[in-house]
């Protein structure tokens, strides 16, 4: 019993002035509370409350469940209590059989006792199953038994509190343990697209998925640099025990180039914080660029192979792809396709294979490219180097021998005269004339070079030689003179070409 | 003791809005996600809203989706479902109901308030 | 979205009798089941949460169990307040959805 302090308030005291009693079945419970200042008696087991206004608290035939604590509380808020267990033989257990623990945490397995006298108050496995090796509890009898630092791995355990009475062992109801889980890592975060590009108008729809131990995992859409709060939907799944996953999903129904930034999805629990980010580009109208992997003006020997390549940027989606050259759209030789199989790629290859190139097919070949909202094109111009061919050689009637010859680039031609029957021609003739006969053209066909010598300055048999060259290769023609007295016989021309 | 009381129902016509209350006591409305559920007459449950303890996270049945909205304002311990664009399958008992918290259902209801949508 | 099946739809007992209504998930949904009674012109009770635990203050003539897909919910001793519509209602992911109800009338 309290101890009074005159001029002080005391509690209120309680007869029996005990601090526990212990009751049979169907006995009275009579309890007295004296206090000048009563207000009330209050009774708690588990979750149950009750309370009464009278001072002497009188339960004519006690019940079991009428076990608990019963707190007299005066005026001046000062209480004194009493515990009374209520033995009944048939009923040695209050039960809550509610029970949730927190990982690392203790929690109470609430099983109060009736009986204080009973022996061997301890936690059993259902169905004569151990009880993890590392489970340790401690028993209170007006509480139930506190299991101390609950592992997760002892989630859903099944388990009875015990008693031995007479030297049999008695179990209560069974309780099935849910382990709440603690945070040990930080949520995992991800999103459906690193980077987005639309146009005005279109819809933006970008989806986080944040995964963690359980649902109280935190998680939100931030724009970068804003404050403003998003609009986001959400989805959940359990996916089993401490595997939870939430989908936040961002919408912004018609996206303007001002909505254009860095969307983050953060997530945090007690343990830590994660994020992930997502671009989002919005541009007024689609776009094409195209950028030539090779140079757009190509030099190529006859009969060699070309390929034209370029990549090209488009948004939207590309629909319409052609290869022209001389006003003729290509049908094959040519393949287009992505530059990554990614969902959100924009970059395109084009490659247009020519092959065994003539010299008549040198000239402008371009690529035409459309979508939905823009045009684009790019050209190659292509040169077909040719060795140079001698078309013509000739002795003209005013006594010029003239050679004429035709390749790409323009070739050079050189005059030689081999005296006598000399197979080297080693002195060099000055013409008297070169002309480029059809410079004046489109600068990719073979070039056309005339050259004339005066054969008045020949007075010796000999051959002349006119040799046509470019960086390809060289030919050469030959005049074959034969002198009869002071006259110039025929002039028989053979042509010798060197590779 | 926890009571959840529903109110704001009535006859509406298609395409018109109506917000539904359901004002909580006997407990914080901040430490509960709150849901509600429908009835159509003579049909079974229909589970059409969640919100968080923390109203941070909100979730719809697609039936639903775009066009209702549910809220909470913890100060008032209020729970709220605005319904736009109603439709005369909307025409059911509306229920608000506590979510116990750890996924373990929902255990106290409202006595539900009748929603009409005809014209 | 998952899909609640319950069976019967409808059942006839009598007083004392056990009585069993099964639920059935299109996927799993782990324990995350609950099972709910409701009354004419009443608003439903929650009676089972996670597959099988008594939700206070519900006798326990009522049981509950399954995982995965499969759930029954289990009346060892009908009594005469049992007659009622019950209904199973998975929140294991969203949107949450209920069963069709099994209703239990006296034979």
């Known amino acids: 019993q309290p101890s009074v302090s005159p001029g002080e308030p005391s509690p209120p005291s309680i007869h029996p002035g005990k601090s526990d009693l212990i009751v049979r079945v169907g006995d009275e419970i009579r309890l007295l509370c004296t206090d000048p200042g009563f207000v009330k008696w209050t009774f708690e087991i588990l979750d149950e409350t009750n309370e009464n206004k009278q001072n002497e608290w009188i339960t004519e035939k006690a019940e079991a469940t009428n076990t608990g604590k019963y707190t007299c509380t005066n005026k001046h808020g000062l209480s004194n209590s009493i515990y009374v267990f209520v033995r009944d033989p048939a009923k040695l257990f209050l039960v809550d059989r509610s029970l949730y623990g927190k990982e690392d945490n203790d929690t109470l397995v609430r099983c109060p006792l009736t009986d204080p006298e009973v022996t061997n108050y301890s936690l059993k496995g259902c169905q004569g199953k151990p009880l993890p090796k590392d489970l340790r509890f401690i028993p209170d009898p007006k509480a139930g038994i506190m299991i101390k630092s609950v592992k997760r791995a002892y989630h859903r355990l099944c388990l009875h509190c015990s008693v031995d009475q007479e030297g049999k062992s008695v179990l209560s109801e069974k309780f099935i343990l849910k382990v709440r889980p603690a945070f040990k890592a930080v949520p995992v975060v991800s999103v459906s697209k690193a980077s987005y590009l639309l146009r005005e108008g279109e819809e933006f729809t970008v989806t986080c998925t944040i995964k963690d131990v359980s649902s109280s995992v935190y998680s939100t859409w931030k724009r970068e640099n804003s404050q403003t709060k998003l609009q986001e939907k959400y989805n959940s799944w359990h996916h089993g025990d401490f595997n939870y996953e939430r989908q936040a999903t961002l919408t912004i129904s018609s996206a303007r180039v001002n909505d254009s930034g860095v969307f983050m999805c953060y997530a945090n629990n007690t343990f830590g914080s994660a994020n992930v980010t997502t671009t989002l580009e919005v541009v007024d109208k689609g776009f094409i660029n195209i950028f030539p992997m090779i140079n757009t003006t190509v030099f190529v020997n006859d009969g060699e192979n070309v390929d034209l390549i370029v990549e090209y940027e488009a948004f939207p989606k590309p629909e319409h792809q052609q290869w022209i050259y001389m006003n003729r759209t290509f049908t094959d030789k040519w393949e287009d396709y992505p530059k990554s199989e990614n969902e959100s790629n924009i970059r395109y290859v084009s490659e247009l294979h020519l092959t065994r190139l003539k010299g008549t097919e040198g000239g402008t070949y371009t690529f035409l490219v459309s979508n939905s909202d823009v045009n684009a094109a790019i050209a190659f111009n292509v040169y077909v180097n040719t060795k140079p061919e001698i078309l013509t050689y000739d002795r003209l009637v005013n006594g010029m021998l003239q050679c004429v010859a035709a390749g790409f680039p323009e070739p050079t031609i050189d005059w030689y005269f081999c005296p006598g029957t000399e197979q080297r021609c080693s002195a060099s003739v000055l013409p008297v004339d070169v002309q480029t006969l059809n410079s004046s053209g489109p600068p990719f066909g073979k070039l056309v070079v005339q050259s004339s010598i005066d054969s008045s300055a020949f007075k010796h048999n000999g051959t002349v030689e006119c040799k046509a060259y470019n960086d390809v290769g060289k030919t050469s023609a030959y005049f074959n003179f034969a002198f009869k007295g002071n006259n110039k016989e025929q002039i028989h021309p053979h042509t010798l070409f060197t590779p | 003791e926890v009571q959840l009381l529903e109110s704001g129902g009535g006859l509406v016509q298609p395409g018109g809005s109506l917000r539904l209350s359901c004002a909580a006591s006997?407990?914080?409305?901040?430490?509960?996600?709150m849901s509600w559920v429908r009835q159509a007459p003579g049909k079974g449950l229909e589970w059409v809203s969640t919100?968080?303890?923390?109203?941070?996270?909100?979730y719809y049945a697609d039936s639903v989706k775009g066009r209702f909205t549910i809220s909470r304002d913890n100060s008032k311990n209020t729970l709220y479902l605005q319904m736009n664009s109603l439709r005369a399958e909307d025409t059911a008992v509306y229920y608000c109901?506590?979510?116990?918290?750890?996924?373990?259902?929902?255990?106290?209801w409202g006595q539900g308030t009748l929603v009409t949508v005809s014209s | 979205d998952i899909q609640m099946t319950q069976s019967p739809s409808s059942l006839s007992a009598s007083v004392g009798d056990r009585v069993t209504i099964t639920c059935r998930a299109s996927?799993?949904?782990?324990?995350?089941l609950n099972w709910y009674q409701q009354k004419p012109g009443k608003a439903p009770k929650l009676l089972i949460y996670?597959?099988?635990s008594l939700h206070s203050g519900v006798p326990s003539r009522f049981s509950g169990s399954g995982s995965g897909t499969d759930f029954t919910l289990t009346i060892s001793s009908l009594q005469p307040e049992d007659f009622a519509t019950y209904y199973c209602?998975?929140?294991?992911?969203?949107?949450?959805?209920f069963g069709g109800g099994t209703k239990v009338e006296i034979k």
């Open positions: 996927q799993n949904i782990y324990t995350y």
């Open positions: 996670d597959a099988s």
């Open positions: 109901a506590r979510d116990s918290g750890y996924d373990r259902g929902l255990d106290y």
């Open positions: 209602q998975q929140s294991s992911s969203t949107p949450y959805t």
């Open positions: 006997g407990f914080t409305l901040t430490s509960y996600a």
């Open positions: 919100i968080s303890g923390s109203g941070g996270y909100t």
